[in-house]
Amino acid sequence: DDESSKPCCDQCACTKSNPPQCRCSDMRLNSCHSACKSCICALSYPAQCFCVDITDFCYEPCKPSEDDKEN
């Protein structure tokens, strides 16, 4: 399964406004997650990409949390 296919984010930051403005700062290789509308990639190999979308929510984390690992 391609790393970029699942819309998820480990490093999401939001303003505390209602509604918020959230941005994912995860770096991914070669492409952004599947729900990203504006993806910027560095001219390197492999390309390092990040999504510059501003959303009103955070996607679920990609990595299971420590709590999830225990259960």
Partner: antibody, heavy 120, light 112 residues
Amino acid sequence: EVQLQQSGAELVKPGASVKLSCTGSGFNIKDNNIHWLRQRPEQGLEWIGKIDPANGDTEYGPKLQGKATITSDTSSNTAYLQLNSLTSEDTAVYYCATDLYSKPVWFAYWGQGTLVTVSA
Amino acid sequence: DVLMSQAPLSLPVSLGDQASISCRSSQNIVHSNGNTYLEWYLQKPGQSPKLLIYKVSNRFSGVPDRFSGRGSGTDFTLKISRVEAEDLGVYYCFQGSHVPWTFGGGTKLEIK
């Protein structure tokens, strides 16, 4: 478990002030916003205002601007609502609630409410 | 201010029935970011309100799937597919798209 515990009922005289408290447990109030709302007898719900306890920033609804002051004390995980120059129109149940702004949800968890009665 | 109007004021139902509550806003409640911030709350007798639905159709955690929300623009509906005794109380819609944020006047769901 996220819980908000509010202070007890208040009976106050017209013209007086009152300060209500809302203490969080199971979460850190700095992580979200704390909102205050009220419900007057036989009436609907009304948003009063909110505070970001992480920095003390506040916002108020237009109807209670000047009457309500929201503060917080992060060391005790508590938010406060002070109401000044009370009249019988301010008789209501006052609720605090925490948002989950990153969902985004406005009023995710509510306190049990504090009844404020303004009477001579 | 955006006026939120709910209908009916009172809704008598039999347990197991479907219930439908309408909420209309006096103006379009699409936020400038393109999203619609319409929430539904249930206040049971003697309790504080509890969140059921956010952003028109998203169930909050722990809310049974018999609750569903839909709508757009100015017209919104909360449906309860099979009413249970624990669903009785007053339902409020709320809009967070335009300041000041406002609630509907409530719909009381009661036993027929």
